[in-house]
């Protein structure tokens, strides 16, 4: 997260890392009590590596009564994710097991009315990913708030050029953005999930390169049809 | 640039033993698991042998045809993946593919083949 | 084992038509995980093969439009919307969904 601060500990419970052999990958966001929602370009590169989800953290060092470590029992790609567009990047991962509900790990409603967020809006996104454009990762949780971007302002030929399709959205990035290590974690509006961040290799903190989240209510049917 | 660099083919009598070697580079090789796959000359692709990371304990995988004769390993402090092929037969004959294994795809990543020729 | 039978052995088609390979397992394909491994290589003459699709349907970086992959359980399928000569080679199907891992016998789409 650029531009932002360190979240209040465990205010956000639904906030997961996604981690492969123990390092913080990706954001993640508690959607049910078995299943976290991520971006489906965060395993691209995690090749053979041990997939975990780690649920109920601040700090990704230091003991937490709350913090605790899941095996991922099955990924589930968005059947028409690829590798060279961020067209449907979306994730669900199966925790090996259902996660221990507490004030610090709860499910995060999601939105199913497929309607676009006002521009505008204030929307909350967090995450473990890089802090500063020389790549430092932070160990405490960051947020930042971020207001809405209109979709036609999005794809203007100076901005994302027409790429931001209805199932997107995109959040102002000036100075203040989300980051590389910040895919698949939440931009929640109104205390409900409304994108998942996505996981190109956009530049950051540039007004010009709004930040891209995939709009999870364009994805309801594909989330219910996996978590059923 | 993502690239694997087979070598260590070549002629060896029936019963002979040959070491293929395949040098990575351009990834962060101790992430992934590496397969090799072989093609006789004018015939089809089949897979030999697979290795996985260390993180799933270099576990290693075999076609039925290989098993007991062939042995893959890694040395992940130099990205190289190696297949030991002993009690070598005639129908060993063929080109050797070094691959790389992907998390949601299988194999995305191929060297240009190294060729072992078994014959008396 | 788990047995890939392609077919045809052989298809000659005329550039701009389409192509279709058909690709069938002996036994269920789908993983343990709920994904199906099934996926389809390009080697050209001379060359190493090339992915041009995984999990059934979906196109590898790079992979043209016009390639694409449909089917489940045991049957699956391989289009190609307008053949160009570059796509001239040879189109294997894969699984990787259960060890020992196996591939089609390949299909060689020549010019007609």
């Known amino acids: 997260i650029l531009g932002g601060r360190e979240a209040e500990a465990h205010a956000r419970p639904y906030m997961a890392s996604v981690q492969v052999n123990g390092e913080h990958l990706c954001g993640g966001v508690l959607v049910a009590e078995q299943w976290v929602l991520s971006a489906a370009h965060c395993l691209e590169d995690a090749a053979d590596g041990k997939v975990q989800v780690l649920l109920g953290a601040h700090s990704l060092s230091q003991p937490e009564p709350s913090k605790r470590l899941y095996d991922v029992l099955r990924a589930v790609p968005h059947p028409d994710s690829r590798p060279d567009t961020i067209d449907h990047d979306l994730l669900l991962l199966q925790l090996s097991e259902k996660a221990t509900l507490g004030p610090a790990v709860r499910p995060l409603p999601w939105q199913r009315v497929d309607r676009d967020v006002e521009p505008g809006t204030l929307c909350d996104v967090a995450g473990w990913g890089i802090v500063s454009h020389a790549g430092r990762r932070p160990d405490r949780l960051q947020h930042v708030l971020l207001p809405v971007l209109d979709r036609a302002t999005c794809n203007r030929r100076t901005h994302h050029d027409g790429a931001i399709t209805q199932r997107m959205m995109c959040a102002e990035s000036n100075r203040r953005d989300s980051c590389k290590g910040d895919s698949g974690g939440p931009l929640v509006c109104g205390g409900v999930l409304e994108g998942v961040v996505t996981s190109g290799s956009r530049v950051c903190g540039n007004r010009k390169k709004p930040g891209i989240y995939t709009r999870v209510a364009s994805y309801a049917a594909w989330i219910d049809s996996v978590l059923a | 640039e993502v690239q694997l660099v087979e070598s260590g083919g070549g002629l060896v009598q029936p019963k002979g033993s040959l070491k293929l070697s395949c040098a990575a580079s351009?990834?962060?090789?101790?992430?992934?698991?590496m397969n090799w796959v072989r093609q006789a000359p004018g015939k089809g692709l089949e897979w030999v042998a697979r290795?996985?990371?260390?993180?799933?304990?270099?576990?290693?995988y075999y076609a039925d045809s290989v098993k007991d004769r062939f042995t893959i390993s890694r040395d992940d402090s130099e990205s190289m993946v190696y297949l030991q092929m002993n009690n070598l037969k005639t129908e060993d004959t063929a080109m050797y593919y070094c691959?790389?294994?992907?998390?949601?795809?299988?194999?995305?990543?191929w060297g240009t083949g190294t060729t072992v020729t078994v014959s008396s | 084992d788990v047995l890939m039978t392609q077919t045809p052995l052989s298809l000659p088609v005329s550039l701009g038509d389409q192509a279709s390979i058909s690709c069938r397992s002996s036994?269920?394909?789908?993983?343990?995980?709920?994904?199906?491994?099934l996926e389809w290589y390009l080697q050209k003459p001379g060359q190493s093969p090339k992915l041009l699709i995984y999990?059934?349907?979906n196109r590898f970086s790079g992979v043209p439009d016009r390639f694409s992959g449909s089917g489940s359980g045991t049957d699956f399928t391989l289009k190609i919307s307008r053949m160009e000569a570059e796509d001239l080679g040879v189109y294997y199907c894969?699984?990787?969904?259960?060890?020992?891992?196996?591939f089609g016998g390949g299909t060689k789409l020549e010019i007609k």
């Open positions: 691959v790389r294994h992907g998390y949601y795809w299988y194999f995305d990543v």
């Open positions: 351009g990834f962060s090789f101790n992430t992934y698991a």
């Open positions: 290795i996985r990371s260390k993180s799933n304990n270099y576990a290693t």
């Open positions: 036994q269920s394909i789908v993983h343990s995980d709920g994904n199906t491994y």
């Open positions: 999990r059934v349907s």
């Open positions: 894969f699984q990787g969904s259960h060890v020992p891992y196996t």
